[in-house]
């Protein structure tokens, strides 16, 4: 028997504020059984960004269907993406347990925001085909 | 408050059908994964189907598979059990059951009574 | 025939502790769950996860898992606990939902 591991195929993933962040993780087998929980960060300082079993997260929403008995898409998206989400996002698989027991994590997925961009728009004078290609950066 | 309410059941006969629904309320139907679980006469419980919260997955044992079809309205709250070629040995009360995130499940109907007779 | 082994019959004096035992599923990769039926009743889940116990229901009512058995474990059992008692599971590597055949718990007196 296969041991089980968890993929995060992207390295880093890059978004731009106010927009969405998919980030795509798969588990090579349902076997043990335990809840796929997401993280960001490391150590006991981890911060839980998702728990499949519990737990609200209004921002956070699975990609794949969760009911589905061979579901193995532990992918996640995560809504109106702000400067302060930055940071390495993991995937980790527990084995059931009192209380579950972390078996592996993914190698993990650096999320970096870009600032919203946003256009000047002028009516007047000869510089406007130059002025419309400004980027004015928000934080 | 979480609450599920079978109805359908009834006398057929051997080799007829009969569809029994499961209306649900006071959660978010569809978002939970359903299943129906039978009890014969004076018998212990038997699962009989499972579906997935968006409906496209189905999951049966094989006493019943090629017989019976699970299927759910998530736009009107509902679960459905279409049981084709009846047998004696599907007299049973029916429960609709919610499914936890793990399959088990934490919600039953008070269950509907179908008997297979001539 | 049940995938899923229990006691057929239990028997306990009020006040004392009753447990039910479970066996025959694969450990790593089954969920079980604990139901509770009385006559002319539906099921009321007890446990689910092996060992979670819905807000609803007494503490009294205990999960336990130790290898391929689980253990329900009622302490200080009352007359209304006298019921039906369902193990059932989640079968990872089947996609199904075993059940035990059930056991009847008498309490005494």
């Known amino acids: 028997e296969e041991e089980l591991q968890v993929i995060q195929p992207e390295k880093s993933v890059s978004v731009a504020a106010g927009e969405s962040a998919t980030l795509n993780c798969t588990a090579t087998s349902l076997i043990p059984v335990g809840p796929i929980q997401w993280f960001r960060g490391v150590g006991p300082g981890r911060e839980l960004i998702y728990h499949q079993k519990e737990g609200h997260f209004p921002r956070v929403t699975p990609v794949s269907d969760p009911t589905k008995r061979n579901n193995m898409d532990f992918s996640i998206r995560i809504s109106n993406i702000t400067p302060a989400d930055a940071g390495t996002y993991y995937c980790v698989k527990f084995r059931k347990g009192s209380p579950d027991v972390e078996l592996k994590s993914g190698a993990g997925t650096e999320l970096s925001v870009r600032a919203k961009p946003s256009h000047h728009h002028h009516h007047h004078g000869l510089n406007d085909i130059f002025e419309a290609q400004k980027i004015e950066w928000h934080e | 408050e979480v609450q599920l309410v079978e109805s359908g059941g009834g006398v057929v006969q051997p080799g007829g059908s009969l569809r029994l629904s499961c209306a649900a309320s006071g959660f978010t139907f569809s978002s939970n994964a359903m299943s129906w679980v039978r009890q014969a006469p004076g018998k212990g419980l038997e699962w009989v189907a499972g579906i997935s919260a968006g409906g496209s997955d189905t999951y049966y044992p094989a006493s019943v598979k090629g017989r019976f079809t699970i299927s759910r309205d998530n736009s009107k709250n509902t679960l459905y059990l279409q049981m084709n070629s009846l047998r004696a040995e599907d007299t049973a009360v029916y429960y609709c059951?919610?499914?936890?995130?793990?399959?088990?499940?934490?919600?039953w109907g008070q269950g509907t009574l179908v008997t297979v007779s001539s | 025939s049940y995938e899923l082994t229990q006691p057929p019959s239990v028997s306990v004096s009020p006040g004392q502790t009753a447990r039910i035992t479970c066996s025959g599923g694969?450990?790593?990769?089954?969920?079980y769950a604990w139901y509770q039926q009385k006559p002319g009743q539906a099921p009321v889940t007890l446990i689910y996860?092996?060992?979670k116990r819905p807000s609803n229901i007494p503490e009294r009512f205990s999960g336990s898992s130790s290898g391929t058995t689980v253990t329900l474990t009622i302490s200080g059992v009352q007359a209304e606990d006298e019921a039906d008692y369902y193990c059932g599971g989640y079968d990872q590597s089947s996609y199904t939902n075993p059940f035990g055949g059930g056991t009847k718990l008498t309490v005494l007196g």
């Open positions: 059951a919610r499914e936890t995130w793990n399959h088990l499940f934490d919600y």
């Open positions: 996860s092996d060992d």
């Open positions: 694969s450990y790593s990769s089954y969920y």
